[in-house]
C-alpha cells in the first residue's frame, strides 16, 4: 500500500465508531486545511504545532444515506466531467465546460485530472485568472490540459519523484509521495484522491498549477531580489548545477537576508572558497520538499552534508527552529524554491569561536576579553574545550586576569580534534603548553577532571567540545596529593610501611580509593603494629584500594554498577548516583581529585575484599572494628597471599633486533621471546594483575585483552642507545592486536570489556624484582608473548 492509502486506512479506523466508511480528518484551527489523520497527528492532536479539531466525513468514494449511520452508500460513478461535480470541484467543471474540454472528458479515453478545488481558484492571482477567462479557447484550455494526464493514475501509482507528462505540451507534473501520506503535484496537495470515473480518475488539489518552463538557475538569474545569492552561487561554482536535471529544494536567501549578516562575517566567508561553497550547499536539498508535505519537524541532509531541521508553525515554515520562509513553493522544472529572509550558515563555514552556543557565552566572552580570540587565526586549526556557563564560579571570574588567561589557555588546543578523533590515553597539548589526558568511557568522554556534554561541533578552523566543568590539569602525583592532605596521614603511613610508596609516585594510570583518618577511628597503636606486622595482609588491604586505569566518577553511566579488578586481585563495585560515587555501596566523600598518575576518590571507611578470608583472630577483631559494611569471612589458619611488587621506573628503551615477530602460546615455565624487525621504540609499563606484574606495550587505538594467569619467566632483550620522538612514533604505528597470557589449568575467562579498556593504561617500563626489595640496575625491557 502507498503512504496515502495507509494514512487513509488509519483515518478509516479512527472514524469507524461513527459508522461504515467514515474517515476521521483533522482540521487546523482557524484555517480550512484538512488532513486525513495519521497516527502521529491523531495522538498529538495537532498539525504544525497548531491544535486541530476532528471532523468525520465520508471516506473518498462513499456517501451518506438518510436515516442511516455513517456512509453506507457508494458514490455514483460517472465520466470525468460528471465526477468533477461529485467531488465538489464545480469551478473546474465550469471551466472545463466553457473551454470546450467537456466533450473530451465525457468521451472515450482514460484520464487523470488533478482538479483544483473551488477555493484554489479563488486563491489564484486575480490577473492570471482574468487572463484565463478572457481567452478560454486557448489559455484556459491549455491551463486545464496542464492539469491532466492521458491515463488513469491512482495514488498508489503516483510514486515519489515521478515526473509525468501532462496533456499540455508534455510539460512535466512533478509527483511527490511523502511518508506522512501527503501526495503533491507540482507542490499542490491532493486533498481528495482516487475518485474513480468511468474514463479515468479525479484527484482534487489545493491550488491551481502554473506552467513550469524554468529551472532553478533560470529563476535565480531573473530575480533581482536574489542577486546576492546568485552572485554567491557563481562564486561557489554552483549556479550551473542548479540548471541541471534533478529534484532539488533550494532555500534561497533574499538580498535582505544577506543584509542581516554582519559584514565581517560575509566578507570572510566570501573570501574563503571552502566556506562559501559550504554556505551555498547548506541551502540546497537533493530531495524535493514541498511546504504542504511539512506537517511536523523533520531533519533533512543538505548538499553540504550537515542537516537542517524543517518544521512548521501553522502556515509558516521554520528552519532550524526559526520562522524564516516568506514565499513557499516556487516550482521549477528541476525542483522547488522557498524564499527565506535569513542566511543559513553551516558549522563548516563558521570560525571555531562562532560555534559556541548560548550555554558557552561566558567562555567565549572571556576568550575575547583576554585577547585569546585574536590568536585563533582563520587559517589555523584549533579545538575549544568550552565549559558551560555555570562552570564559572564567581571566584573564578573575579580572579587575576593573568591567572584567568592561564586557565582559559588550558581549554584551547593547538590542533583540530573532532569527537571521533578522541581515544583513551590520548595526550592533547594546549596553546599554553599544558598536556591534557583523554579518558574514554562507555557513555562519556572526559578530559582530565571534566566530562563532555552533548553539542560537539566542527567548524572551518577547528572544533568545539562542551564540558561540565573547568578543566584543571593535574600538577601532583597520587603520593604528593595524599602527603599534602592531613586527612590521609594514617593511610599514607600504612602505605609506606607496606613498601608501596613508589607505586603512587611513579608515572602510571591508577584509581585510588583513599581512606581518610576517619576510616581508622578507634585503631590503637598496638592494633596498628599488628596490621603492619603482617605485610601480606597490609599489602592485600591497601592494594584493594588501588585499581589500574583512571576512572573518573563523572564518567560513569548513572545508576549502573561498574565492576573493576583491583591490583590486589578482587573486584570492587562502583556506581554513580545523584552526583555521588558509591564505592562498594559506600558514599565517596569527595571524588575526581586528579593527579599526574591517576585519580583519587575519598572514602571514610576502609575497604576490604569480601572474597578474602581472615585466618587470624586478632586481625579479624581489628578489621571488624574498622569495617562494618561487610561480614568478613573467617577461615582459621588461612593466610594472605604474597603480592609481588614492582618498581616503576619511567624510562624508554630502544631495541634493535633482527628477524620476524614470533608469537607463541606460553605455558608456565617457558621462556618468551619476541623478535622484531628494524628499529622499534617501545613504551613499556607494568600492571599488577592477579598479583602478577604483566608488562604491556602501549598501543592506544586498540582495545586489547589480557587473560590473567600464573607467573611467567621472560627473556629480556635490550640494547642501549637514545631514542627520538620520530622513531617512537614510527614504532607506535605498528599494529598491536591482542595481549594474552595462558592460564595453566585456569578457566581462561576474559575480563569484561569495560575492565579491559582500562587495563592497558599506563606509560612506564618496569622490571620484576623480589617482594620488598629495591634494585638499581641497568635499564631493561621485558616483552610478554602475544598472540595475534
Amino acid at each position: 500500500n502507498s503512504y496515502y492509502d495507509k494514512v487513509l486506512a488509519h483515518s478509516r479506523i479512527r472514524g469507524r465508531d461513527q459508522g461504515p466508511n467514515v474517515c476521521a480528518l483533522q482540521q487546523i484551527l482557524g484555517t480550512k486545511k484538512k488532513y486525513f489523520s495519521s497516527c502521529k497527528n491523531w495522538y498529538q492532536g495537532a498539525i504544525c504545532g497548531k491544535k486541530t479539531t476532528v471532523l468525520y466525513e465520508c471516506c473518498p468514494g462513499y456517501m451518506r444515506m438518510e436515516g442511516m449511520k455513517g456512509c453506507p452508500a457508494v458514490m455514483p460513478i460517472d465520466h470525468v466531467y460528471g465526477t468533477l461535480g461529485i467531488v465538489g470541484a464545480t469551478t473546474t467543471q465550469h471551466y472545463s465546460d466553457v473551454s470546450k474540454l467537456r466533450e473530451e472528458i465525457e468521451g472515450k479515453g482514460s484520464y487523470t485530472y488533478f482538479a483544483p478545488s473551488n477555493e484554489a481558484w479563488e486563491n489564484l492571482d486575480s490577473d492570471i485568472r482574468r487572463g484565463l477567462e478572457n481567452n478560454v479557447n486557448v489559455e484556459l484550455l491549455n491551463a486545464l490540459h496542464s492539469h491532466m494526464v492521458n491515463k488513469r493514475m491512482l495514488t498508489k501509482d503516483l510514486k515519489h519523484g515521478m515526473v509525468i507528462p501532462s496533456m499540455y505540451n508534455n510539460l512535466g507534473l512533478f509527483i511527490n509521495h511523502y511518508p506522512n501520506g501527503v501526495v503533491t503535484v507540482n507542490c499542490a496537495r491532493v486533498i481528495h484522491g482516487n475518485q474513480i470515473a468511468t474514463n479515468g480518475v479525479v484527484h482534487v488539489i489545493d491550488r491551481v498549477l502554473t506552467q513550469i518552463g524554468t529551472s532553478i538557475q533560470d529563476f535565480l538569474e531573473a530575480e533581482d531580489d536574489l542577486s546576492s545569492f546568485r552572485a554567491a552561487a557563481i562564486t561557489s561554482d554552483l549556479l550551473e548545477s542548479l540548471g541541471r536535471d534533478g529534484h532539488f529544494t533550494l532555500f534561497a536567501p533574499t538580498n535582505e537576508a544577506f543584509e542581516k549578516l554582519p559584514r565581517g562575517v560575509l566578507e570572510r566567508i566570501m573570501g574563503d572558497k571552502v566556506a562559501s561553497e559550504a554556505l551555498m550547499k547548506y541551502h540546497i536539498l537533493n530531495t524535493l520538499q514541498c511546504s504542504e508535505a511539512i506537517t511536523g519537524g523533520a531533519v533533512f541532509e543538505t548538499m553540504e552534508g550537515n542537516t537542517i531541521e524543517i518544521g512548521c508553525e501553522g502556515d509558516s515554515i521554520s528552519i532550524n527552529g526559526i520562522k524564516m520562509v516568506n514565499k513557499k513553493d516556487i516550482v521549477t522544472k528541476n525542483g522547488v524554491i522557498h524564499l527565506i529572509d535569513e542566511v543559513l550558515i553551516p558549522d563548516s563555514a563558521k570560525q571555531v569561536i562562532e560555534l559556541a552556543g548560548k550555554q558557552q557565552t561566558t567562555f567565549t566572552d572571556l576568550v575575547a576579553q583576554l585577547g585569546l580570540a585574536s590568536s585563533l587565526k582563520p587559517d589555523g586549526e584549533y579545538t575549544l574545550l568550552a565549559p558551560v556557563n555555570n562552570a564559572f564560579s564567581d571566584d573564578t571570574l573575579s580572579m587575576d586576569q593573568r591567572l584567568l588567561k592561564l586557565i582559559l589557555q588550558n581549554h584551547i588546543l593547538k590542533v583540530k580534534v573532532g569527537l571521533s578523533d578522541l581515544y583513551n590515553g590520548q595526550i592533547l597539548e594546549t596553546i599554553g603548553g599544558k598536556q591534557l589526558r583523554v579518558f574514554v568511557y562507555r557513555t562519556a568522554i572526559c578530559i582530565e577532571n571534566s566530562c563532555m556534554v552533548r553539542g560537539s561541533k566542527q567548524g572551518r578552523n577547528g572544533a568545539i567540545h562542551i564540558f561540565r566543568e573547568i578543566i584543571q590539569p593535574a600538577e601532583k602525583s597520587l603520593h604528593d596529593k595524599l602527603r599534602q592532605d592531613k586527612r590521609f596521614s594514617i593511610f599514607l603511613s600504612l602505605l609506606e610501611a607496606a613498601d608501596l610508596k613508589d607505586l603512587l609516585t611513579q608515572p602510571g594510570d591508577w584509581t585510588l580509593f583513599a581512606p581518610t583518618n576517619d576510616a581508622f577511628k578507634g585503631m590503637t597503636s598496638e592494633e596498628r603494629e599488628l596490621l603492619i606486622g603482617d605485610k601480606n595482609a597490609l599489602q592485600n588491604i591497601i592494594l584493594y584500594h588501588l585499581t589500574p586505569g583512571v576512572y573518573i566518577g563523572k564518567g560513569f553511566e548513572p545508576g549502573v554498577t561498574n565492576i573493576l579488578k583491583t591490583t590486589q586481585g578482587s573486584k570492587i563495585y562502583l556506581k554513580g548516583v545523584n552526583e555521588t560515587l558509591l564505592v562498594n555501596e559506600l558514599k565517596s566523600k569527595e571524588s575526581d581529585i586528579m593527579t599526574t598518575n591517576g585519580v583519587i576518590h575519598v572514602v571514610d571507611k576502609l575497604l576490604y575484599p569480601a572474597d578474602i578470608p581472615v585466618g587470624n583472630d586478632q586481625l579479624l577483631e581489628l578489621l571488624n572494628k574498622l569495617i562494618k559494611y561487610i561480614q568478613i569471612k573467617f577461615v582459621r589458619g588461612s593466610t594472605f597471599k604474597e603480592i609481588p611488587m614492582t618498581v616503576y621506573r619511567p624510562a624508554m628503551t630502544k631495541i634493535q633486533i633482527e628477524g620476524d615477530p614470533d608469537f607463541r602460546l606460553i605455558k608456565e615455565g617457558e621462556t618468551v621471546t619476541e623478535v622484531i624487525h628494524g628499529e622499534p621504540v617501545i613504551k613499556k609499563y607494568t600492571k599488577i594483575i592477579d598479583g602478577v606484574p604483566v608488562e604491556i606495550t602501549e598501543k592506544q587505538t586498540r582495545e586489547e585483552r589480557i587473560i590473567t594467569g600464573p607467573e611467567i619467566k621472560y627473556t629480556r632483550i635490550s640494547t642501549g642507545g637514545g631514542e627520538t620522538g620520530e622513531t617512537l612514533q614510527k614504532f607506535l604505528q605498528k599494529e598491536v592486536s591482542k595481549v594474552t597470557k595462558f592460564i595453566e589449568g585456569g578457566d581462561g575467562h576474559l575480563f569484561e570489556d569495560e575492565e579491559i579498556k582500562r587495563l592497558l593504561q599506563g606509560d612506564t617500563p618496569a622490571k620484576k624484582i623480589p617482594a620488598n626489595k629495591r634494585v638499581q640496575g641497568p635499564r631493561r625491557r621485558s616483552r610478554e608473548g602475544r598472540s595475534q
Partner: antibody, heavy 118, light 110 residues
Framework: QVQLVQSGAEVKKPGASVKVSCKAS????????ISWVRQAPGQGLEWMGW????????NYAQKLQGRVTMTTDTSTSTAYMELRSLRSDDTAVYYC???????????WGQGTLVTVSS | QSVLTQSSSASGTPGQTVTVSCSGS????????VNWYQQLPGTAPKLLIY???QRPSGVPDRFSGSKSGTSASLAISGLQSADEADYYC???????????FGSGTKVTVL
C-alpha cells in the same frame, strides 16, 4: 542598463552641510544597497558607509560616525548622503556605488565634487 | 593613511604581464576577501575582481586575482594601453569594522 546618476558639484564653507543625491535606474532599487566612497584630490579611496535601499539599515565608517547620514527614497529610486560640520579635509569627489554585499561596488556613479573652502 | 599597502607604481610594455601587490594584516586580508578596482584617468572606479579571484561579467580574463595569507595580488597579462590606470585593492577590516582600500598603484604602459 544599470546607471547611477549623481547631483552636481558643490562648494561649501567650513561648518556647513552638504547633501549629495544618487538616482538609480536599470535595476530594482530596493533589492540592493548603496555604498558611498570618497576620494580626496590626488588621494586614494575612502569608504564612508552603506545603506540598504530595502530596509534603510545603515553601516557607517567609524571615522564619520555622527557627521554622516545616508537615506533613500524608494519612490524615486534615489539615495542621499549628507555630511555635516564640513572641514577643508572633506574636499573630495564623492561617489555612490551599488552594493549587494556579495559583489561590493559593482556599479559606480560619475562622482560629485564637493569643495570645502572659506 | 591607507590600511592596505600597495606599491605606488608598476609598468610594462604591451603584451607583458604586470603584477600589482597588496599587503595587509590578519584583521583585513588575513581574515577576509580582497576586491580590486580599476580607475581610468578622470573616471569613476570600476569593479575588476571580487572575492579574491572572481571576475564580474565583462571583465577580460587577462585580469586575475589571488590571495595568500595577508597579501593579495592582481595580475594583468597581455598588457594593453587601455589598461593604464590606478588599481586599488580593498578588504573589510574586522578591527576597524570598516571597508579599507589600498593606497593605489599606478600602472603605466610603456
Amino acid at each position: 542598463q544599470v546607471q547611477l546618476v549623481q547631483s552636481g558639484a558643490e562648494v561649501k564653507k567650513p561648518g556647513a552641510s552638504v547633501k549629495v543625491s544618487c538616482k538609480a535606474s536599470g535595476y530594482t532599487f530596493t533589492s540592493y544597497g548603496i555604498s558611498w566612497v570618497r576620494q580626496a584630490p590626488g588621494q586614494g579611496l575612502e569608504w564612508m558607509g552603506w545603506i540598504s535601499a530595502y530596509s534603510g539599515n545603515t553601516n557607517y565608517a567609524q571615522k564619520l560616525q555622527g557627521r554622516v547620514t545616508m537615506t533613500t527614497d524608494t519612490s524615486t529610486s534615489t539615495a542621499y548622503m549628507e555630511l555635516r560640520s564640513l572641514r577643508s579635509d572633506d574636499t573630495a569627489v564623492y561617489y555612490c556605488a551599488r552594493d549587494i554585499l556579495v559583489v561590493p561596488f559593482d556599479y559606480w556613479g560619475q562622482g560629485t565634487l564637493v569643495t570645502v573652502s572659506s | 593613511q591607507s590600511v592596505l599597502t600597495q606599491s605606488s607604481s608598476a609598468s610594462g610594455t604591451p603584451g607583458q604581464t604586470v603584477t600589482v601587490s597588496c599587503s595587509g594584516s590578519s584583521s583585513d586580508i588575513g581574515s577576509n576577501r580582497v576586491n580590486w578596482y580599476q580607475q581610468l584617468p578622470g573616471t569613476a572606479p570600476k569593479l575588476l575582481i571580487y572575492s579574491n579571484d572572481q571576475r564580474p561579467s565583462g571583465v577580460p580574463d587577462r585580469f586575475s586575482g589571488s590571495k595568500s595569507g595577508t597579501s593579495a595580488s592582481l595580475a594583468i597579462s597581455g598588457l594593453q594601453s587601455a589598461d593604464e590606470a590606478d588599481y586599488y585593492c580593498a578588504a573589510w577590516d574586522d578591527s576597524l569594522s570598516t571597508y579599507v582600500f589600498g593606497s593605489g598603484t599606478k600602472v603605466t604602459v610603456l
